[in-house]
Amino acid sequence: VPGEAEQPAPELVEVEVGSTALLKCGLSQSQGNLSHVDWFSVHKEKRTLIFRVRQGQGQSEPGEYEQRLSLQDRGATLALTQVTPQDERIFLCQGKRPRSQEYRIQLRVYKAPEEPNIQVNPLGIPVNSKEPEEVATCVGRNGYPIPQVIWYKNGRPLKEEKNRVHIQSSQTVESSGLYTLQSILKAQLVKEDKDAQFYCELNYRLPSGNHMKESREVTVPVFYPTEKVWLEVEPVGMLKEGDRVEIRCLADGNPPPHFSISKQNPSTREAEEETTNDNGVLVLEPARKEHSGRYECQGLDLDTMISLLSEPQELLVNYVSDVRVSPAAPERQEGSSLTLTCEAESSQDLEFQWLREETGQVLERGPVLQLHDLKREAGGGYRCVASVPSIPGLNRTQLVNVAIFGPPWMAFKERKVWVKENMVLNLSCEASGHPRPTISWNVNGTASEQDQDPQRVLSTLNVLVTPELLETGVECTASNDLGKNTSILFLELVNLTTLTPDSNTTTGLSTSTASPHTRANSTSTERKLPEPESRG
């Protein structure tokens, strides 16, 4: 073509795959009449006529572009729709008059690759490999042109390094003309790379400029020999009986060796294997003082045929023994004195406290409690608490009952009970003393006795309310070797309709309908008089 050598560089038109390329014929009016133009595509230096413009009217030539070309901008621009990678070529327009001139356009096509897909080598890498081993593979699909790949380790780009880092990239052309890039990172890794984060980055161009896409970060399994095994105990700090204690074996190698945990038998000094759970953890629950001792872990690395032993670990499960109180069952006369002594063993220093059982009041800090000039009220429960102050929750207790000799002592002297005739009444009477009294009733009925504590007894009587009973009332008598005492229950008839809810004169009332021989549970609904009770 005359004058082709001195032709300027073609105009660059950049478009993304799938969009429309606007090819504007840049011939000036002096160079040619735009109403009479031929358009060619140039591929491998071969020109193919693809479109004709005559008197401003366009006509596609048969072939690959037939359906995708149209004229725009009053005939000066050729629009190519649905651009594909195969469209990346030179297009030229040639004016026919006054003389043949042409204008060249270089069409550049771009397509962003998909998100890079990274796959780590699932088999892992030994640290002492002689040459770089496959770490991960990065695949970037359907990009155009071929994107560039950069590999990163812990955020830093990796460069080719002889015998250390090798990046092997290859690409395939899809039927669409798009490229799929595959890049394999091979590297020699060290133990410190066990936590290293690797990712790949695809760099590509679009008409809008340079862009990049990053893969997710991955870590590769790194295998390195075990050099040390050790024991770890949880929880850390002071252990006590009842705790859940976990003893686990750990190693600095990957994969870890096969572990066994053993405890030294103090008498034979032999290591005896302890049964671990599926995770190789020895669980002591609840921990007992017998679990104290010397533990060690053996790791068998069958890959290198090396057995490794941990440093032994002394485990101390702190305890407090059963608490002993002497005297164990003290009996004293009123006015006398009593010394209670508390003893216990522990793996740590103990603190003792004496408390009154009924009130929880602290009476003494120390193992000895002295009681002088004993009154009847001093009888009852005393609790010794032996505790280890340095280990919260580690304590044992013992209750001792102090008995003061004396005749029966009644819970009340007199009581009024409101009743209905023919109802079955449930009456109760309580007495205390040492020796423990027994209770008898002055009327026939079903009586049952219940020991409340070593000095106290409760008797209940089921009796039918009769006119005679209303007249005489009911007496309960408590007696022991040292005497007897009586309580009286006065029975009074009540009219349910006249009874006011705030009446304070009733002492025992059944709200169930009282029909002949109906059993009424008077104890559950009993309302006590506010009057002070005399105590025999």
């Epitope: 002492n128 295998f223 032999e270 045929m305």
Partner: antibody, heavy 117, light 112 residues
Framework: EIQLQQTGPELVKPGASVKISCKAS????????MLWVKQSHGKSLEWIGN????????GYNLKFKGKATLTVDKSSSTAYMQLNSLTSEDSAVYYC??????????WGQGTSVTVSS | DIVMSQSPSSLAVSAGEKVTMSCKSS????????????LAWYQQKPGQSPKLLIY???TRESGVPDRFTGSGSGTDFTLTISSVQAEDLAVYYC????????FGGGTKLEIK
């Protein structure tokens, strides 16, 4: 017949390195661990380290870590031990041995290494 | 580290005699899960490489004459040669593999 054939005696200068080889025959090389042992003149035996020819994993006596490097070439059924920064203390006979049940059932004939200026 | 102590350091016996040599470890070599003692005995004849005689404290290696017997457990082990032969002249080493590998100092057996 199972054999472990080691290289001949070595005379090396202080500070230099030496690489001893141990060629295995008569059994599947990758099925057994290879161990290395040092015997100083008139002295007892000292374990240096082990290597698994199949996985390439190795383990060392901490005393020899950094002094000895164990490698294998599966294609030639050969185990290697490189000793570096040699001093007169490293003068000894070095043995390779095949591992079985945490014992050493076959031994090479030994390689004498003399470090002298 | 586990220390292996062998005694006596040397002994001289006549052919046909019974001989015992002792090996003590600074801690038990009995693996609690396998119930095996991680101890082996080796024989090293003058100018030769060591040879495995006994492993797991009492298992005789194939091809080893039955006059060689290993016994013991935990920390105390014994190698017994029931009737010493002239070819038994050697240094005998015990070795533990319970925690890495360590050899004893050896017992030198001489024939009178």
């Amino acid at each position: 017949e199972i054999q472990l054939q080691q290289t001949g005696p070595e005379l090396v200068k202080p500070g230099a390195s030496v690489k001893i080889s141990c060629k295995a025959s008569g059994y599947s090389f990758t099925d057994y661990i290879m161990l290395w042992v040092k015997q100083s003149h008139g002295k007892s035996l000292e374990w240096i380290g082990n290597i698994n020819p199949y996985s390439g994993s190795s383990g060392y006596n901490l005393k020899f870590k950094g002094k000895a490097t164990l490698t294998v070439d599966k294609s030639s059924s050969t185990a290697y031990m490189q000793l570096n920064s040699l001093t007169s203390e490293d003068s000894a006979v070095y043995y390779c041995a095949r591992g079985k049940d945490f014992a050493m059932d076959y031994w090479g004939q030994g390689t004498s290494v003399t470090v002298s200026s | 580290d586990i220390v292996m102590s062998q005694s006596p350091s040397s002994l001289a016996v006549s052919a046909g005699e019974k001989v015992t040599m002792s090996c003590k470890s600074s801690q038990s070599l009995l693996n609690s899960s396998t119930r095996k003692n991680f101890l082996a005995w080796y024989q090293q004849k003058p100018g030769q490489s060591p040879k495995l005689l006994i492993y797991w404290a009492s298992t005789r290696e194939s091809g080893v004459p039955d006059r060689f017997t290993g016994s013991g457990s935990g920390t105390d082990f014994t190698l017994t040669i029931s009737s010493v032969q002239a070819e038994d002249l050697a240094v005998y080493y015990c070795k533990q593999s319970y925690n890495r590998y360590t050899f004893g100092g050896g017992t030198k057996l001489e024939i009178k």
